[in-house]
């Protein structure tokens, strides 16, 4: 908190300056005013003030607009807006995506903080739905942030903004969030053809169903290991040897390195020896020949 | 990419004069504050000298105010530090450096050496 | 404000895991920047914020602290990165500069 002290004389601000940046707090607090400040938000970051500055002039602008800034404000606040905390960003009503970008660029390098996450938060709740450009907007400045949404939040993407995500922005998804993504993915692409399918649905393949793992296997898809490796185990378990290969196509090799993780490893278990015998990789651990395989849950199922 | 060059150093006797230049490229100069920063030889860094872009407003470290003067010319793209009654402790190099928004040195000369010495 | 360094030198190797301090004499937030200064060259920036990574600088090169206490860490040494490394204060005028930590081959 700033001592209330007279401005020297001579030293009101008339308008907000290069003459300001020596300042002393107390000077900055008594000299400038807070209307003044808030019409001239675009010149401070044309000034390098000093972070001890900028807390004077956040400290400012908080009296003159205790129930949050306006947008004209908050949108030329510059790097001022590192000294925001989230309880600030709460009382704004931020509706232009030209503000976020403003907002965003100043954070660029940081992590992204409870500031903006509090900012983004407030910023997709007024628009009522991640749109396509403001998912382009997020996801440019933090890859991952569709993959930090819970999948409730998710389920508010609509398919059209799917065609904004790159495949980094879901290396940190977990299946839950791919369920939710996954068949947003595949209607968005519905329109495309086969191999130009299968490059934009394959990083949200983590969430496909077993049955589209069989459809993708009569398409000569050559999937590739790390893909394969991300697939629900229970959407391959299903799969038999010859689906299998059709879909790994010259990768299916790879299946020997992975052969003790999962969902290779369960996948084996479920196989025929005999079956994976014809695939000439050595895996081990199929059902030796001859024994009978119940599925259980089919049991109960028809029980 | 931007380029900050300076000249203007040598040898130079106790009470001598010399002035610095600092061309400036690859920026819009007249945006940036400038400054100039010296380094004693074996030594740390020390800020000297502060411009702001519009060349109004300047502050001098206290071991160089009186003696030395900093300038600007933005229709030149060039920075100059004018430095009087110079002193044995003035031996430096000296660095003319840009400044981002925030209060620090972005982009930094590759520097001048200044030797004060009889 | 005046910022003290530690150590004021140092000897690793590569791949050492290696980290200098820099503490200020009263708090400044996060108005912290570190710089890298090889021989004969101008000092590069590295870090500002106390924590934000210059664009183009290796991510190995990490910062943290607030108030009075900061940290450069670089995690895996590399030969270009033996140099002198210094902390600079922006919380208030004037800008001042800590001693500077030189990191030297074992």
């Known amino acids: 908190e700033v001592e209330k002290t007279a401005c020297p004389s001579g030293k009101k601000a008339r308008e907000i300056d290069e003459s300001l940046i020596f300042y002393k707090k107390w000077e900055l607090e008594a000299c400038v005013d807070a209307a003044l400040l808030a019409t001239q938000m675009d010149r401070v970051n044309a000034i390098p003030f000093t972070y001890e500055q900028l807390d004077v002039l956040k400290h400012k602008l908080d009296e003159l607009y205790p129930q949050g800034y306006p947008e004209s404000v908050i949108q030329h606040l510059g790097y001022l807006f590192l000294k925001m905390s989230p309880e600030d960003i709460r009382k704004w009503n931020v509706t232009s995506l030209e503000t976020l970008k403003a907002l965003l660029e100043v954070n660029k390098g940081h992590e992204m903080s409870p500031q903006v996450a509090t900012l983004i938060d407030r910023f997709v709740k007024g628009r009522g739905q991640l749109d396509k450009d403001t998912l382009d907007t997020l996801t440019a400045f933090y890859p991952g942030y569709l993959c930090s949404l819970s999948p409730e939040e998710l389920s508010s993407v609509p398919p059209s903004s799917i065609w904004a995500v790159r495949p980094q922005d879901l290396d940190t998804c977990d299946p839950r969030q791919l369920d939710v993504l996954y068949p947003k993915a595949r209607l968005a692409f519905q329109n495309m053809n086969g191999s130009e399918y299968f490059v934009k649905i394959q990083s949200f393949l983590g969430g496909a169903p077993t049955e589209d793992l069989k459809a993708l296997s009569q398409q000569n898809v050559s999937m590739d290991l790390a893909t394969f490796m991300k697939l629900r185990t229970d959407a391959v378990l299903p799969l038999t040897v010859a689906e299998v290969q059709k879909l790994l196509g010259p990768h299916v090799e790879g299946l020997k390195a992975e052969e003790r993780h999962r969902p290779v490893r369960d996948w084996i278990l479920r196989q025929r020896q005999d079956d994976l015998d014809t695939l000439g990789l050595g895996l081990q651990g199929g059902i030796p020949n001859g024994y009978l395989v119940l599925d259980l849950s089919m049991q109960e199922a028809l029980s | 990419q931007v380029q900050l060059v300076e000249s203007g150093g040598g040898l130079v006797k106790p009470g001598g004069s010399l002035r610095l230049s600092c061309a400036a490229s690859g920026f819009t100069f007249s945006d940036y504050y400038m400054s100039w920063i010296r380094q004693a030889p074996g030594k740390g860094l020390e800020w000297v000298s502060y411009i702001s872009s519009s060349g109004s407003t300047i502050y001098y470290a206290d071991s160089v105010k009186g003696r030395f003067t900093i300038s600007r010319d933005n229709a030149k793209n060039s920075l100059y530090l004018q430095m009087n009654s110079l002193r044995a402790e003035d031996t430096a190099v000296y660095y003319c450096?840009?400044?981002?928004?925030?209060?620090?040195?972005?982009?930094w000369g590759q520097g001048t050496l200044v030797t004060v010495s009889s | 404000i005046q910022l003290t360094q530690s150590p004021s030198s140092l000897s690793a190797s590569v791949g050492d895991r290696v980290t200098i301090t820099c503490r200020a004499s009263?708090?400044?937030?996060?108005?912290l920047a570190w710089y890298q200064q090889k021989p004969g060259k101008a000092p590069k920036l590295l870090i500002y914020d106390a924590s934000s990574l210059e664009s183009g600088v290796p991510s190995r090169f990490s910062g943290s602290g607030s108030g009075t206490d900061f940290t450069l860490t670089i995690s895996s040494l590399q030969p270009e990165d033996f140099a002198t490394y210094y902390c600079q204060q922006f919380n208030s005028y004037p800008l001042t500069f800590g001693g500077g930590t030189k990191v030297e081959i074992k």
């Open positions: 009263q708090g400044i937030s996060s108005a």
């Open positions: 450096a840009s400044t981002s928004p925030r209060p620090l040195f972005q982009h």
